[in-house]
Interface confidence: low
């Protein structure tokens, strides 16, 4: 007996069972893993009273403690609708079934003399149903529900008596069953019997307050189940051949301080007093936990040495619940001020040291949802996901020997002390209906899918690409808004007079007259931060860099009044410097953050975008960015993520719209503004750059979800891109949408009325689509009532807490932004793509794993969707060069201009060209390539400024 | 181009067993969203629904006709099969195939594709 | 098993509205698909999930679904659509499609 469970809070160097990646395990269980499925009899049999049934100690708790609940007659049903349950099994394609036969319907009052005929018959037809279809019966004797007659007359599991009479039942069972039965379960839970039983009072019989006989409750409970065991193991073994244990249920909890000594001597205290409890004397030396009989020695029973032989190793196998009902109510757990987790996986490690490493069957295990949730129980899924990945990994990365799962239940029905305001089950019962059908929830379907495939396959990206870019490929690197020095840092060269310094005097300059020196012409290594700017663009070896000018900077009065020529000097210091290196610039002239709208003054005191003025003011802006910097720079974005800009207008749907629709309109009338005046002579290209993660439906399983993740990009990028590349006119998925909610009431929302010319002016101007692709959302269907932007498209987010994510809940799904290059050529067929910027915040300073993981990954859809979908992908621009101080971090360098690891990372993807064969030589020519010039870059670094 | 073509005999005999395919191009039976359904239209009456075989290979039958239907699939020939038993003069009509999109296992969006469809005659 | 009721024809005048009815109980509930069948030809989808239209079905045919009643709605009607159409559900208590007993639409004159 090892008792070594504590170990699993130490976290001790040598002793490191859970293995810390973040990284979900895609992997098979073990190749006979055993797939189940669970109920009790007392939640889904009904029939309480039927064709002989005895009454329990639960039909009686329902009819005098538990208001509104007029018994669990209505349930499931399962008596009756025994073939119903059998098709359900059947559609999961379980292994097994585990199902607790009800005392009382065998024995209604408790003592086993001539068995009630029909109850006989009903288990005896259910286990030969089961052998039939290849499904292995696990049985459980006692699932909570004691002949009220044993109640009545002894008191229940108080008096010791019951334990033979509990016996000579077992032997009946065996005698009746054990040809057909391999597995047997003698207690469900009996931590929940003897706790809310006879603690709390919230469980049949329903008596509180006395310490004592909660612990002489539970102490029966151990010998009842020994001598079940004993019984078995002498007088049916040797020609039955099964296996027999106890189903024990527990929390599990985590220090508030994982250094501190005492905080995990409570952890162990805690999953002791509950855990250990039965478990000790099981699975462990046959005695009560040493802190147990320290602590509760005036109420605690013992176990004389020969009860402490007879106890040890009753077990053939380790049964484990891990479910709500050992979770809730929270104040009725022993927490011992720690915090409860829901941590299978480590639950399972501390089983394991704790009680030398025994076979495992998980007998229950599940969560619950509302009531009024009905067969798309989307979180349940999520719930399943989480906890089979943890014990996949148990299994895989921790060598635990888990043999097999029990998911619960099969069916919603009556949950204890919840009774009918919860439900667990994978299918759907209505209990207010005669045939009490069985409809498979989304759980079902996906506890289908994982017996099918043994497992989690990786079906969701295909393999890894070898190959490589085109020579034309735009590798860049995104930063937001640049703010221009003021003033030029060097101003010695552009004063013409002389100056003479009164050293010893007043300590002051004064000037020589008569003098007057050469000046020369300002220069842009007269700005510091370009310095800066250009030794972090070398390090990248990009040959493309995206950066937002200052709007509010260059016109600080929002028109041509007032021009600052000293930042339109800045910047274009900034895009010549650039190219010397080999770098050109993509030009972003408006781009506007949460906290800041980088508008001009007047104009944002002027309504800012919901006055369409602005849209006016920012052609004029615009034409001035083309005409003072367009000779050399060729790519421009108009406005960064206008589709966003809803964070800020969300006062309501209108005011989003409303500003959505003027930021469409500048954007055209600077593009028309660049056809007609600048496209002649200068050449680039002109696009707006749009948000554009992806969307999946939380749940794969409900097509309100799948409609929803289609709304979700019609509403964050065809809102945008539709009257831009296609029509001139909103999506009118979108429009119908808002229109009948608003029909309905539900929204006072609506979208624009376009006009012919506003159509005419909108339609077609873009030269290229440019995307903000960062991660891929989990969205589901929900009916939100309300007038803003966000409850209009009746959409929820999800968070799947098995995925890869940033400390910003960013998950990491590369082949999102694969089915998004798919979609947006679908929608608005083959263009040119630039990804204008994509990236992840990563907490490291200096090897930012989770960054470069991210690039290689998302790289690689991007490679894909060139290489095998043919979609014209032209760029890639990494975000972003540097970030900002506490601020989430997404940046390749600090704010301080550290270089992190990923720099080497991406260098080695540009100079790649992707990811070619090994010995792969194909080369660009040397005016395709943009080759690295080391002078260039040895000046920069050395340049006085 | 998503295409489906039946094929089959032109004239059965009474009691005979009809057996027809469904021949599927530009998309897989084994997509996850795809299902294939047979219905059956009797000249000058109303369609009628025979039978749906779902990507996961779980079939569904008419509950008038089920003790006759049987619907199969043949992923690697891309091919859906319905045989129908014990054929009567009642039977005779044309017979479609028709692609449906199911999202997340039960969920039609109707059936988006029909093949042109094949007629039989059952006829002594 | 689940029933739809349809009226056996229905005439409009070209360029007018023409509203074909699909009867059934708590139908609002079920989504519910229509296809138009032409002499000789086979059915096409023309609405599905109540009112979304497939790619090239022209916006004049539109879907509502409440109550007992789905109506498939053809505004603007012109001779062409002259046909049968057919509403049907998927019935997931039973597994099964259903279709309803199909209308005749007669463009008058």
């Known amino acids: 007996f090892s008792g070594d469970g504590r170990a699993i809070w130490s976290k001790n160097p040598n002793f490191t069972p859970v293995n810390e990646s973040q990284l979900f395990l895609y992997d098979t269980f073990p190749k006979n893993f055993f797939w189940g499925i669970g109920t009790g009899a007392l939640q889904v049999e009904g029939s309480w009273k039927k064709d002989g049934k005895g009454p329990s100690i639960w039909d009686h708790f329902i009819h005098t403690h538990l208001k509104n609940v007029s018994s669990t007659n209505g349930s499931s049903d399962s008596y009756i609708f025994l073939e119903k349950d059998l098709s359900a099994l059947d559609f999961i394609g379980v292994s097994f079934y585990q199902f607790s036969i009800s005392w009382p319907r065998l024995f209604p009052d408790g003592i086993v003399t001539v068995a009630n005929a029909k109850g006989l018959q009903y288990y005896s037809t259910l286990l030969d149903a089961l052998v039939l279809r290849n499904i292995e019966p696990i049985v459980t004797l006692y699932h909570w529900d004691l002949p009220l007659a044993l109640q009545e007359k002894y008191g229940g599991w108080k008096n010791d008596t019951i334990i033979d009479i509990f016996n000579d039942y077992a032997t009946y069972c065996f005698q009746m069953f054990g040809d057909r039965v391999k597995y047997w379960i003698t207690i469900h839970n009996p931590y929940l019997v003897a706790w809310h039983g006879y603690g709390t009072g919230m469980h049949a019989p329903g008596e509180k307050g006395n310490l004592a006989a909660v612990y002489t409750v539970g102490h029966n409970l151990i010998k009842a189940h020994s001598k079940v065991w004993h019984n078995y193991n002498t007088h049916f073994r040797p020609h039955q051949k099964g296996w027999l244990s106890i189903t024990l249920g527990s929390h599990w909890i985590e220090p508030n301080r994982s250094e501190n000594t005492m905080d995990i001597f409570k952890c162990q205290q805690s999953m002791v007093s509950v855990l250990g409890w039965f478990a000790n004397p099981i699975h462990g030396d046959g005695d009560y936990p040493e802190g147990m009989r320290k602590k509760l020695f005036s109420v605690l029973p013992i176990f004389s040495e020969a009860e402490k032989h007879e106890m040890r190793g009753t077990a053939d196998f380790f049964a484990f619940s891990f479910g709500p009902n050992n979770f809730k109510p929270l104040n009725t757990m022993a927490k011992m001020g720690q915090n409860v987790s829901l941590n299978l996986r480590e639950a399972l490690n501390w089983i394991k040291l704790e009680y030398n490493n025994p076979r495992i069957l998980i007998a229950e295990n599940g969560w619950f949802t509302d009531s009024r949730v009905k067969t798309e129980d989307t979180t349940a899924i999520y719930m399943m996901k989480n906890f089979l990945s943890q014990v996949l990994q148990a299994i895989r990365l921790d060598e635990i020997r888990v043999f097999g799962y029990t998911a619960w239940s099969l069916l919603d029905g009556f949950e204890w002390q919840d009774a009918y305001t919860i439900r667990r089950g994978l299918f759907y019962v209505d209990f207010n209906s005669k045939q009490k059908e069985r409809k498979p929830k989304s759980s079902a379907h996906y506890y289908k899918q994982i017996i099918r495939e043994n497992g989690f396959s990786l079906k969701e990206s295909t393999p890894d690409v070898q190959g490589q870019f085109p020579c034309d490929f735009s590798w860049g690197v995104t930063e937001s808004v640049l703010k221009p020095e003021s003033v030029a840092s060097s101003p010695q060269f552009s004063d013409p007079h002389l100056y003479v310094w009164n050293a010893t005097g007043n300590r002051l300059l004064h000037r020589v007259e008569g003098v007057r020196l050469k000046t020369r012409p300002a220069q842009c290594t007269d700005f510091v931060n370009i310095k800066k700017q250009l030794e972090m663009l070398a390090r990248m070896k990009v040959t493309h860099y995206r950066f937002a000018l200052d709007w509010a900077s260059v016109l600080p009065t929002g028109n041509l009044s007032a021009v600052n020529r000293q930042a339109l000097r800045y910047y274009r210091c900034v895009v010549s410097e650039g190219l010397k290196l080999g770098i050109s610039a993509m030009v972003t002239l408006y781009y506007p953050t949460h906290a800041h709208l980088g508008l001009p003054e007047p104009l944002l005191h002027a309504d800012g975008w919901l006055n369409p003025s602005t849209a006016e003011a920012f052609q004029a802006y615009a034409g001035l960015c083309f005409q003072e910097l367009g000779d050399l720079v060729k790519l421009w974005i108009t406005i960064n993520e206008p589709n966003r800009l809803s964070d800020i207008y969300n006062r309501s749907g209108n005011d989003t719209y409303g500003a959505a629709h003027n930021l469409l309109v500048a954007h055209a009338l600077a593009w028309r503004l660049y056809d007609r005046q600048f496209r002649p002579s200068q050449r680039g290209a002109v696009s707006l750059s749009l948000h554009a993660d992806w969307a999946e439906p939380a749940n794969p399983y409900a097509d309100s979800h799948w409609r929803a993740a289609e709304r979700f990009l019609q509403f964050e990028i065809a809102w945008f891109a539709e009257p831009l590349f296609k029509t001139g006119d909103y999506p009118a998925a979108m429009r119908e949408y808002i229109a009948s909610k608003h029909r309905r009431g539900l929204s006072s929302s609506a979208l624009p009325r376009l006009t012919e010319a506003e159509r005419r002016l909108l339609k077609g101007t873009v030269d290229f689509c440019a995307l903000n692709h960062f991660t891929t959302r989990f969205v589901m269907h929900e009916q939100l009532a309300g007038s803003r932007y966000d409850s209009d498209r009746d959409i929820q987010f999800l968070q799947d807490i098995t995925r890869l994510s940033s400390p910003t809940r960013l998950a990491v799904i590369p082949w999102g932004v694969r089915k998004l290059l798919r979609w947006v050529r679908r929608n608005y067929g083959d263009m040119d793509i630039y990804i204008t910027a994509s990236g992840i915040d990563d907490q490291a300073l200096e090897d930012d794993r989770l960054r470069k993981y991210y690039l290689g990954k998302y790289l690689q859809e991007v490679l894909k969707a060139y290489l095998i979908d043919k979609v014209r992908i032209k760029g890639y621009y990494a975000f972003k060069l540097a970030e900002e101080k506490s601020k989430p971090r997404f940046g390749f360098f600090t704010s301080d201009f550290k270089a992190k690891s990923s720099i080497q990372f991406y260098n080695k993807v540009i100079s790649s060209r992707g990811f070619p064969f090994e010995n792969s030589s194909s080369r660009c020519s040397q005016t395709q390539e943009n080759t690295e010039c080391t002078v260039c870059l040895f000046l920069v670094q050395k340049k006085p400024l | 181009q998503v295409t489906l073509k039946e094929s089959g005999p032109v004239l059965v005999k009474p009691t005979e067993t009809l057996t027809l395919t469904c021949t599927v191009s530009g998309f897989s039976l084994n997509n996850a969203r795809m299902g294939v359904s047979w219905i059956r239209q009797p000249p000058g009456k109303a369609l009628e629904w025979l039978a749906h075989i779902f990507s996961n290979d779980e079939k569904s039958y008419s509950t008038s006709l089920k003790s006759r239907l049987t619907i199969s699939k043949d992923t690697s020939k891309s091919q859906v099969v319905l045989t129908m038993t014990n054929m009567d003069p009642v039977d005779t009509a044309t017979y479609y195939c028709?692609?449906?999109?199911?999202?997340?296992?039960?969920?039609?969006?109707?059936?988006?594709?029909w093949g042109q469809g094949t007629t039989v005659t059952v006829s002594s | 098993s689940y029933v739809l009721t349809q009226p056996p024809s229905v005439s409009v005048a070209p360029g007018q509205t023409a509203r074909i009815t699909c009867g059934g109980n708590?139908?609002?509930?079920?989504?519910v698909h229509w296809y138009q069948q032409k002499p000789g030809q086979a059915p096409v989808l023309v609405v599905y999930?109540?009112?979304d239209r497939p790619s090239g079905i022209p916006e004049r045919f539109s879907g509502s679904n409440s109550g007992n009643t789905a109506t498939l709605t053809i505004s603007r009607v012109e001779a062409g659509d002259e046909a049968d159409y057919y509403c049907?559900?998927?019935?997931?208590?039973?597994?099964?499609?259903?279709f309803g007993g199909g209308t005749k639409l007669t463009v008058l004159g």
């Open positions: 999930y109540d009112s």
């Open positions: 028709a692609r449906s999109v199911v999202t997340g296992g039960y969920y039609y969006e109707g059936m988006d594709v």
């Open positions: 049907q559900v998927w019935d997931g208590n039973s597994d099964h499609v259903v």
């Open positions: 708590n139908i609002g509930s079920e989504s």
